[in-house]
Each structure stands twice: as C-alpha cells, then as structure tokens.
C-alpha cells in the first residue's frame, strides 16, 4: 500500500491508523493516496515543520489521545485539501498563530479537551469555510471581541466545559448561519442583551451548568428558529415575563435545577412545537390558572422535587396532549377533583413523596388512559370508592409507604388490588399503618373478618361504581409499563460528548434512571 | 354471623337453563365479592366465576354459557347457566370474598334427560 | 392456566402424627412479594373450608395445628398433630390470576 509504516495499518480506502504508545513521531513514510490519518493514544508531544508534506490528497486527520503538548506553526502545511482536523484530547496550551493557514477546505476543526488558555482572531482567521469547531473542556477564561469573526460560514460552536465568566455581546455577531451553540459548563452569571441578536438561525443554545442568575426580557428575541433551548442548572430565580414569547419553533426547553419560585401565566410561549418541559429542582410554591396554556403540544411536564403545595384547577389547561406528569417530592396535602380533568390523553402521573392526606373521587375522573400511578410515600389512609374502576389501562400502581387505615372501609381498596392483580406490577405491598391489631400486616391479606368497623366520617366524596374490570380477555397477565420519556431527563444530546454521566435517579422520577444534565 | 344460603336443588333436562342463587347476611354485602365453585360427583372443585360491583369475570370454560347478576337490595346473587349438558351435573357453590372464607351450603344440580 | 398438582393423592396418618401435603404450581403464584395459594379443607357432604390463605395466614377459627408455607411454585400444607376431626379431602387452591384454579385434592384418612 505504497508504503505503510510498521507501526501503522493501511486499509484499501487510503485509510491509515497509527496508535500505540511505542509511537513517539509522526510515522514515516505515510502513503502518498492516504486520505484519511488517524494518531491515535500514542506518546507523541509535538508536532514538527511538514511531517504530511508527502500526503497532500489527505481529507481526514485525527491526531487525538496523545501527549501532544506543542505543534510548529507550519506543521499542516500542504494539507489544502483537509476537511476534518481533529487535536482533540492533547495536552495543548497554546495554538501557534497561522497554524491553519492554508487549510482552505477545513471544514471541522476539534480542539476539545485540551488545556488551551486562550484563543485569538488571528487563530481562525484563515478558516473562512469552517463549519463546526469544537472548544469544550479547554481552560478558556474569555472570548476576545472578533475571535470568530471570519467564521461566517460556522454552523456548529462547541465553547462548554470551559471557565468562561463573560460573554462579550459581540462576540458572535457575525454568526448568522450557526445552528449550534454551547456554552454549558462555565462560570457565566450572566448573559449581556444582544449576545445572541445575530444568530437567526439558531437551532440549539446550550446554557446549562453556569452560574447565570438573570435573563434579560429579550435575550432570545431574535432566535426565531431555535428549537432547544438547555437552561437547567443556573440560578435563575425569575423568568422575565416576555423572555420566551419569540420562539415559535422551541421543542425542548431544560430549566431544572434553578431556584425559580413562580410561574406567571404566559411565561411559556406561544411554543406550539414544545413537547417536554422540564422544571424539576426548583423552589416553585404554587401552580396558578394558565400557566401552561399555551403548551398545546406539551407532551411531557416535570415539576418534581419544587416545594409545591397548592395547585389552582386549573393550572393545567391546555394541556390536552400531556402524556407524562411529574409532581413528586413536592409539598402537596390536597388536590382539587378537576385538576387533572384536561388531561385527556395522560398516561402517567407521579405523586409520590408529597403530604397528600386524600384523594377525590373524581381525581382521575376523565383521565381514562391512565397507566401508570404513583402514590407511594403519601399520607393516604383509604381512596374512594371506584377511584380506578374505570382506568382500564391502568398496570402500574404504586401505593406503599402509606398509613392505610384497615378498618372496614378498606375493603374496597383490598378488594381492588387483589382483583386487578394481573394488571399491576409486582411492587411493595402496601401495609396497614392503623388500628393497631393489624399494623405492619399487608393490606391485601388481613383477616377480613376481623377488621375493625370503621367510626369515622368519610371525608372524601365517592363517585357512582362503574364496573371495576370489564369481563375481556384482552388484559395482559404481567405488567411492566415504562415510559421513557419520563425515565430519562433530558439529554442534551450532543454528537461530540463521549460520556454521559448517568446518576441514580430514583430521586427525580422514582422509576428508573436518568441523566440530569 | 356470616351466612350465604343458596336455593333448593334443581333437575334439569339437557339444553334447558338453571338460574341459582345465593343470599348474604350477617356483613356487609357491596364490600365483598362473590365467586361460584363447582364440583362434579366424586371429582374436585372448579371455578366458575364471580361478580364485584357489578363487573364479572369468567372462566373461559363457561364462557357464553354463564350469567352471574345481583340484588344489592335482597343482598342475592344470581348464577345462571345456560345449555345444560349431562357433564354439568354437580353441585354448585356460593364463596365469598377473594379468598373463599365462607361457603354456600351448596345446590345440586342435576342434568338428565 | 396454572395448574396446581397435588401429592400425594391420599395420606394415612397415625393419631398425634405429622401429615404433610404438597403442591405445586406450573408457574409462580407469587405478586408484590406474596404467594397466592390458599388451602380448603371439605369434609364429605359439606361445602370447603378456608385454612390457609396467603400461603401461611390461618383463616378465622383455624386450629393452630394447620399451618402453610412455601412461595414461588412449591406449597406445602402441614398438620402437625392429627387429630379425627380431620379426616377430610384436602384441596390448594391459586389465586393470582383467573381462571382460579384447584389442586386434584389430598384426601387425609386415619392409620
């Protein structure tokens, strides 16, 4: 193969892969046809003058997992026809300026995952047909004024995981073709007005995991096409009443894990194209009327983990094509009957972990699609009557960790979880809490015939019984629904993150696991 | 006390229908639900159906053939089974609540032509 | 359906002895971590009566001398002193999911 260096393979489609640690130089000599090059996990640390002058056909070089700490600035020299030039994962602190002089068709240009300190517009001055360029998990400290200046041509702008404090408001003035930018992991506390009135054609901006307490009224005004938008992990206490009102296309919106307080009605939208808003880890009291009116697409809420203790009827209109509602862990005692009875098209709600002493009859009244509740970790001691006699999807029902009362009045309870057995999943039994005959007994083998007759006044209205199971055969004998959009959190799914943190997270939706970042 | 009486034993030719029934006392009677058993001379117990809050389930094996209704007023419930054949003879019995803790005294029936 | 086998088919057992019966499911009768096999006890001409439900909870009235235990598949009623009173069929009964089946029955007689 026109020569292949020992230390290297060389496959028919000019491509050459060289990795191991007894590599310390470039290999010599590389195929003239080669069209790809990979250095890879070898112990070279520096790049000298020309090592590819030979191989000027070369369209992909990926110099990555090295101890490449200095590159000579005429080190690509002759690479005019390279495409793609990976550095990423080196020991690199500097960028020679005019290293990529001369790479007139470079189109990708990673340098993730070094320890650049700073760049300059004369680093990419050059790189006027550049399309994505990789920075994250560098050490940069600022953007100076015009460093991209010239990447006018730029779709994708990677700047996370970097100690970035201030953004200039001109820093990316002259983006106006980038779909991509993100800014995840630094140390912004805020973001100055008019830093993103360029970019019109902004598909994702990644803000997440920054220190950023304020966002101005008309920050994303001009960002008519963005369709995620990652805001979770700041300090955003208020969101400005208008700050969402420009982005028609937005699909995805992360503000987890702030310390919003309230939600005003019509911060959110008009977003016709939200499907999942995620609102888990914040400090939010109170869900008023309206508030997510205008979320008509609204597939999946989650609103676990705040400190919510009253929700007003009708906090939920509009959402008639919720199929996920998460409100666990929160500061819930009661909840009205008609809370829920928009939501058509619901498939699970999450109530664990909050102070719920009742439920309504008619809670889940118009909620027929219902296959998943979660109850766990209440104050509950008895449900009404026929509260799920007419759920004939319902096959997850989570009701332990309860302080079931197992007087007579529990019967109806009893009898309808040892009925519906086939369709509920196996899962810790509840256990009767009082009278204390029976306490610490499972609720669904105490000795009927000795359960104490009941003395209290139900204090929860029932409904008329509806047959509790209708006599089909189509009901499946073992269980296990799960949906996935509320098992995961929202990845914010980048094709050039190559780890995903992945946390236990029976804590933020009490189901599975998720990634919270 | 708990007590679940059912009606007097019934001869029946092939074809014809047997409605029998079983009346509760001594608890309350919405809160439990009711299941009929059968047992052929000399064989064991099988399950017939039973009846809560007026949804029912059958065993497949009747499947079309048996009706269980009831009275909350009079506290009875009602099995019915329709298309008798000779294989159906047995007596028939009332148990209440999930796990069959009280039993009807039991009603013959008898198909013969 | 889940079919339940007993054994053995009958049992003869001296006064004051231990009488053992066994059953055994086709497939687990187990859910929310409970074994859902009940146990009757029919004397000739009378209806069944409850003994064990659950497994290994006595039914109301039920002598100490009955007892149940096993989960998953395999069951297994003890009557750990004999008395005359029962003499009788035995039948284990599963729970978990219609049709709700019985097992062929034990029938316990006197040596």
């Known amino acids: 193969y026109h020569g292949c260096p020992s230390e290297c393979t060389c496959s028919r489609a000019s491509q050459v892969e060289c990795t191991g640690a007894r590599i310390v130089a470039v290999p010599t000599p590389l195929p003239w046809n080669a069209m790809s090059l990979q250095i890879l996990n070898t112990h070279i640390t520096e790049l000298n003058e020309s090592p590819f002058l030979n191989i000027s056909a070369l369209i992909a070089l990926r110099i990555e997992k090295n101890e490449l700490s200095r590159i000579t600035p005429g080190a690509f020299r002759n690479l005019g026809s390279l495409r793609y030039l990976s550095l990423a994962n080196n020991k690199l602190q500097v960028l020679p300026i005019g290293l990529f002089q001369g790479l007139d068709s470079l189109e990708s240009l990673l340098l993730s995952s070094n320890q650049l300190l700073q760049i300059q517009p004369a680093h990419f001055s050059q790189c006027s047909n550049l399309k994505e360029l990789q920075l994250h998990g560098n050490h940069l400290e600022y953007i100076p004024d015009g460093a991209f200046d010239h990447l006018v041509g730029l779709t994708k702008l990677n700047l996370g995981k970097n100690s970035l404090t201030h953004i200039s408001p001109r820093v990316f003035q002259h983006l106006g073709n980038l779909q991509v930018l993100r800014l995840y992991e630094n140390r912004l506390t805020d973001i100055p007005m008019g830093t993103f009135d360029g970019l019109v054609n902004l598909q994702e901006l990644a803000l997440q995991q920054n220190q950023i307490g304020l966002l101005s009224p008309g920050l994303f005004h001009n960002n008519h096409n963005l369709q995620r938008l990652y805001l979770s992990n700041n300090h955003i206490s208020q969101l400005p009443p208008s700050v969402f009102m420009q982005l028609p296309q937005l699909n995805r919106l992360t503000l987890f894990g702030n310390s919003l307080k309230e939600l005003s009605p019509g911060i959110f939208g008009p977003m016709p194209n939200l499907r999942e808003l995620w609102l888990y880890d914040n400090h939010i009291s109170s869900l008023p009327d309206n508030v997510f009116s205008n979320l008509r697409q609204l597939q999946v809420l989650i609103l676990s983990r705040n400190q919510i203790s009253f929700i007003s009827p009708g906090a939920f209109n509009g959402l008639t094509e919720l199929r996920e509602l998460s409100l666990h862990t929160n500061a819930l005692q009661d909840l009205d009957g008609n809370v829920f009875r928009m939501l058509a098209n619901l498939q699970n709600i999450s109530l664990q972990n909050n102070r719920l002493r009742q439920l309504p009859g008619n809670i889940f009244a118009n909620v027929n699609g219902l296959m998943a509740i979660q109850l766990q970790n209440n104050q509950l001691e008895n449900l009404p009557l026929g509260i799920f006699d007419h759920l004939g999807k319902l096959c997850e029902l989570r009701l332990y960790d309860n302080p079931w009362r197992c007087d007579s009045d529990i019967l109806p309870l009893r009898n309808w979880l040892l009925l519906n057995q086939p369709r509920l999943g196996t899962d810790t039994v509840p256990v009767c809490f009082s009278p204390a005959n029976v306490r610490g007994q499972s609720l669904i083998i105490i000795n009927v015939n000795v359960a104490v007759p009941s003395v209290h006044v139900p204090e929860v209205p029932s409904y008329p019984e509806t047959p509790w199971y209708p006599d089909t055969p189509s009901y499946p004998d073992t269980t296990s629904v799960s949906s996935t959009t509320e098992l995961t959190s929202p990845v914010e799914d980048y094709t050039d993150l190559t780890t995903i943190q992945v946390t236990d997270d029976r804590s933020v939706w009490g189901m599975t696991q998720a990634q919270s970042g | 006390q708990v007590q679940l009486v059912q009606s007097g034993a019934e001869v029946k030719k092939p074809g014809a229908s047997v409605k029998v029934s079983c009346k509760a006392s001594g608890y309350t009677f919405t809160s439990f639900v009711i299941h009929w058993v059968r047992q052929a001379p000399g064989q064991g117990l099988e399950w017939i159906s039973y009846?809560?809050?007026?949804?029912?389930k059958y065993n497949e094996r009747f499947r079309g053939r048996v009706t269980m209704t009831r009275d909350t007023s009079t506290s009875t419930v009602y099995m019915e089974l329709s298309s008798l054949r000779s294989e159906d003879t047995a007596v028939y019995y009332c148990?209440?609540?999930?796990?069959?803790?009280?039993w009807g005294q039991g009603t013959l029936v008898t198909v013969s032509s | 359906d889940i079919v339940l086998t007993q054994s053995p088919d009958s049992l003869a057992v001296s006064l004051g002895e231990r009488a053992t019966i066994n059953c055994r499911a086709s497939?687990?009768?187990?859910?929310?971590?409970?074994?859902?096999m009940n146990w009757y006890q029919q004397k000739p001409g009378q209806p069944p009566k409850l003994l064990i439900y659950?497994?290994?909870n006595q039914g109301s009235g039920v002598p100490d001398r009955f007892s149940g235990s096993g989960s998953g598949t395999d069951f297994t009623l003890t009557i750990s002193s004999l008395q005359a009173e029962d003499v009788a069929v035995y039948y284990c009964q599963q729970s978990k999911e219609v049709p709700y089946t019985f097992g062929g029955g034990t029938k316990v007689e006197i040596k």
């Open positions: 659950a497994a290994s």
């Open positions: 009846i809560y809050n007026d949804g029912t």
């Open positions: 497939e687990s009768v187990d859910y929310y971590g409970i074994s859902f």
């Open positions: 148990a209440r609540d999930y796990y069959f803790d009280y």
